[in-house]
Interface confidence: low
């Protein structure tokens, strides 16, 4: 579909691009000696960036620290030192900058306070960091302030003494609503879920915690779970891992009504050394990783039904090192249904796998055209692409960035990888897919930092090097041709690329420092590509593209989860602006149903390489554990259940005799008599 990338030669050079970019390159030198810099975007399409620099000297008795705060309101072209707005206070970098949701314009900075103080101190802004108000807290925060997704005036925080504190007026006043809290999270509709320890401490009571809920910011409470190990929220599901009565194992329970009623998930139980992890969740379903016993570094991915109760095995030997460890699981946001992850083979080699149908089937990534198989390949003509993600980064391989995709840059996926039978420890190259992962091409030789601008209209890259750099590369044709631009005559030690989240901007900021014998000076260069894409895209610049198309002759071509989508996409040859207001235009159409649109319901399974669901053997010797809403149920099924999010209509309807699965529920979790309500009066 596409040739190997070319850099400068053999490519349609853009006229006068050097002059255009030179006129739109803005340098800012930061007048401080800080050791670290953190950057946050405030709001969407506001152009406001906050930069916090910190300088810390650990002395024998105390540590001396200094912070500086800078603000830009033009996407990083110019910065103003606003440290005076926070009274030149040292800001605790471990709390970061707490930026409010959506376009609230809210920012909270947590200050360092002296040892004997009664509580912490924060600086609050609600006008995109134009002004800050200093507020002394009645507690020492343990975590960053958490905004309610529904109302940015509502905040929660945990204190160092495990108190749960809530503010209803953007941190001006605080109230401790509960003590002995281990973990707290905002749910929908300003609900707060939290676990509490009853006897000793969070660590000692693990597996004996209680799960509580408050729907009125701490006026009243309801205990919605006991014997809790941990809990999590994903999509519309609330999950809790609950200790079994008889042993030290635990099981996942799920609720779709904020904890009023619970069902036992049909997932394996796990022991003390194992873990569950929600890999991804949406309003329809959840991907759940269940760790294998022993220190194997892998487990199994299961995908749920629409209730979050019945799970199908999706992928074996899924790489996931330890609790809170590394997994390469990646949601490819540029195409519906696509996920990439890694598996650990018997020989301990790591291989990449991709699914195009939300975990229904996994396969190897297709070998890029015109690429050679590396030393890991047994057969030099047959191999596949393997993607470097979090695990490779954690192993300090020469991988500066994880895979990148953006919802508004349809079909584009950029990642470091190698071509062979498994991930290679050799220096990787950068590969690109323009069709959501079906086909790949080498984009750049060697490791690079990369980012997407103007909804895919421009891709920018900088070589990963331990030497100072002064060249930025860019492509206006989805990575086929590359131009190089020298953005400064004085090379800098590069530390990062920054562009506004959402990939709609045409500005990119290159961060780094210059170092002389005694000083290090932070510097940023912001390059605006607006004059490269000088005209607005017009009708002829776009073409229609059928996503997931693999067999154009087939009437079901492009059907994934019961429907196909046709997109309007920018032609590679068009050099024009999608613009900040660009919204992906797509036309969905429904597909007829087939057995692929159904998963096997409780008590049924699909034998290897079969499409029909067959009833499970009677599982003699132990009862099926099926607990729906915490009490014995009469479950009826025809063995099939529509895959979550599947929109197929007509076609094949797997009608068969409806069975009555009268099974004893073996879970006494949340026996209704155990539920109680409390009032905080």
């Amino acid at each position: 579909r596409r040739g190997a990338p070319a850099e400068d030669q053999d490519c349609g050079r853009l006229p006068d691009f050097i002059a255009k970019l030179t006129n739109n390159t803005h340098q800012h030198v930061f007048d401080d000696l800080s050791g670290s810099v953190s950057l946050s975007w405030v709001g969407d399409s506001t152009g406001v960036i906050l930069v916090l620099t910190t300088f810390q000297v650990p002395l024998v008795i105390v540590s001396f620290g200094q912070s500086k705060l800078y603000r830009s309101e033009d996407y990083g072209k110019n910065f103003k030192d606003i440290t005076n707005l926070i009274n030149n206070t040292f800001i605790r970098t471990e709390f970061g900058m707490a930026i409010g949701p959506e376009n609230s314009g809210k920012v909270i900075l947590t200050a360092e306070v002296s040892g004997g103080s009664r509580g912490g101190r924060v600086f609050r802004s609600s006008d995109f960091a134009k002004n800050f108000v200093q507020t002394d807290l009645p507690f020492h925060p343990l975590t960053q302030m958490m905004y309610s997704p529904q109302n940015s005036d509502y905040l929660l925080a945990l204190s160092t003494e495990n108190g749960l504190w809530v503010s209803k007026n953007f941190g001006e006043k605080w109230e401790e609503i509960h003590k002995a809290v281990c973990l707290a999270k905002w749910g929908p509709n300003n609900i707060i879920f939290f676990t509490t320890h009853v006897n000793g401490s969070c660590k000692a009571d693990l597996g004996a915690l209680e799960l509580w809920r408050t729907s009125d910011l701490g006026k009243t409470f309801k205990t919605i779970g006991v014997k809790i190990y941990s809990f999590g929220l994903g999509g519309r599901f609330l999950f809790a891992s609950v200790m079994a009565d008889k042993d030290t194992t635990r099981r996942i329970h799920v609720s779709t009504d904020q904890g009023d009623t619970w069902s036992m998930a049909q997932l394996p139980s796990v022991g003390q050394e194992q873990f569950y992890s929600i890999l991804a969740a949406n309003e329809d379903m959840v991907f759940m990783h269940v760790d294998e016993p022993g220190d194997t570094g892998f487990g199994t991915i299961f995908t749920s039904d629409d209730r979050g109760i019945v799970y199908s095995k999706s992928l074996d030997r899924h790489l996931y090192t330890t609790t809170g460890g590394e997994t390469d699981f990646t949601n490819v946001t540029s195409l519906r249904g696509v996920y990439i992850t890694s598996t650990l083979s018997e020989d301990n080699s790591i291989q990449s796998m991709i699914t195009f149908d939300q975990g229904g089937r996994w396969e190897h990534l297709r070998k890029p055209e015109n690429s050679k198989c590396d030393a890991t390949a047994k057969n030099k003509n047959e191999c596949s692409l393997h993607i470097h993600a979090s695990y490779s980064i954690s192993q300090k391989l020469n991988v500066p960035m994880a895979p990148l995709s953006e919802p508004n840059a349809v079909g584009i996926v950029i990642a470091h990888g190698s071509v062979g039978d498994a991930i290679s420890v050799m220096v990787p190259d950068v590969y690109i897919s323009d069709d959501g992962g079906y086909s790949w091409a080498k984009m750049l030789e060697g490791p690079h930092y990369y980012t997407i601008l103007d909804s895919g209209g421009i891709i920018v890259a900088i070589e990963h090097s331990n030497r100072p750099i002064n060249v930025i590369k860019f492509s206006t044709d989805e990575g086929q041709c590359w131009q190089s631009y020298v953005f400064t005559q004085e090379p800098i030690y590069f530390t990062g690329l920054a562009s506004e989240p959402g990939a709609r901007s045409m500005n990119i900021s290159i961060w780094g420092f210059t170092e002389s014998f005694i000083t290090r000076q932070w510097v940023s260069y912001t390059v605006d590509f607006k004059d490269i894409l000088e005209r607005n895209c017009e009708e002829d610049d776009y073409t229609t593209w059928l996503a997931h198309s693999t067999d154009p002759g087939d009437y079901k071509d492009g059907c994934i989860l019961g429907y196909k989508e046709q997109f309007l996409r920018l032609r590679k040859s068009s050099v024009c602006q999608n613009g900040r207001d660009y919204v992906v235009a797509k036309q969905p159409s429904v597909c007829p149903c087939s057995l692929e649109d159904f998963l096997c319901d409780f008590g049924y399974f699909r034998p290897e390489n079969a499409s029909e669901c067959v009833e499970q053997p009677e599982l003699k010797g132990h009862e099926l554990e099926f607990c729906l809403y915490g009490k014995e149920e009469h479950l009826t099924t025809n063995g099939y259940r529509k895959i979550p999010g599947d929109k197929c209509q007509g076609g094949m309807n797997p009608a068969r005799e409806v069975k009555d699965l009268k099974k004893k529920c073996t879970s006494n979790f949340l026996n209704p008599t155990k539920q109680n309500s409390k009032s905080n009066s």
Epitope: E538, E539, Q566, D581, A585, Q587
Partner: antibody, heavy 126, light 107 residues
Framework: QVQLVQSGAEVKKPGSSVKVSCKAS????????ISWVRQAPGQGLEWMGG????????SYAQKFQGRVTITADESTSTAYMELSSLRSEDTAVYYC???????????????????WGQGTTVTVSS | DIQMTQSPSSLSASVGDRVTITCRAS??????LNWYQQKPGKAPKLLIY???SLQSGVPSRFSGSGSGTDFTLTISSLQPEDFATYYC?????????FGGGTKVEIK
């Protein structure tokens, strides 16, 4: 240069429906958003809804939801607006208009409408 | 829906005059504002898009400014063919909404 030519004037009884057509000529039709805007006698302009023909799906103002249907036929480069349950206050000139830029913007009509039909007068009277 | 308020609703001016029409949005609409000119019995004509960008073919005596909630259409030197009704239109929120119009008449 694109031109939009609308169907002729209509006189309708209350409770009935009217369907107005808008044919594009002299340029491409499919990918631009086509809006329908009405203007009651002596009054201002009111956006009713729009469609991007290539995608078929229409977007409607809440006020007209359930009463208006906007469709497009790519093969004849024609857009249609049907308004049902007519009442006297629906008496107006109905215009079709083309969004001035390609619809990166889905069903939000950001950059204004640069090509307009000549207008179709619909009179609702018993 | 976002309300658009134009003022004045009508004005009288002479050829060569500088004319200013204002439009206020009920909430911030960034720069998603367009201006149209309409003559009796005719369809509207797009003059300005994105608050300040002049539509192709429109004379340079027309200019637009503003962002957020307050916007202005200025005709630097009124010509005989400029006597018409002018409408502003916001396109930040759905549905797009128009102002009530400003009628520019001959003094």
């Amino acid at each position: 240069q694109v031109q939009l030519v609308q169907s002729g004037a209509e006189v309708k009884k209350p409770g009935s429906s009217v369907k107005v057509s808008c044919k594009a000529s002299g340029g491409t039709f499919s990918s631009y958003a086509i809006s329908w805007v009405r203007q009651a006698p002596g009054q201002g302009l009111e956006w009713m809804g729009g469609i991007i023909p290539i995608f078929g799906t229409a977007s409607y103002a809440q006020k007209f939801q359930g009463r208006v249907t906007i469709t497009a036929d790519e093969s004849t480069s024609t857009a249609y607006m049907e308004l049902s349950s007519l009442r006297s206050e629906d008496t107006a000139v109905y215009y079709c208009a083309r969004e001035s830029r390609i619809p990166g913007s889905g069903y939000y009509y950001y950059y204004g409408m640069d090509v307009w039909g000549q207008g179709t007068t619909v009179t609702v009277s018993s | 829906d976002i309300q658009m308020t134009q003022s004045p609703s009508s004005l009288s001016a002479s050829v060569g005059d500088r004319v200013t029409i204002t439009c206020r949005a009920s909430q911030s609409i960034s720069s998603y504002l367009n201006w149209y000119q309409q003559k009796p019995g005719k369809a509207p004509k797009l003059l300005i898009y994105s608050a300040s960008s002049l539509q192709s073919g429109v004379p340079s005596r027309f200019s637009g400014s503003g962002s957020g909630t307050d916007f202005t259409l200025t005709i630097s030197s009124l010509q005989p063919e400029d006597f018409a009704t002018y409408y502003c239109q916001q396109t930040d929120g759905k549905p797009p909404t128009f102002g009530g119009g400003t009628k520019v008449e001959i003094k």
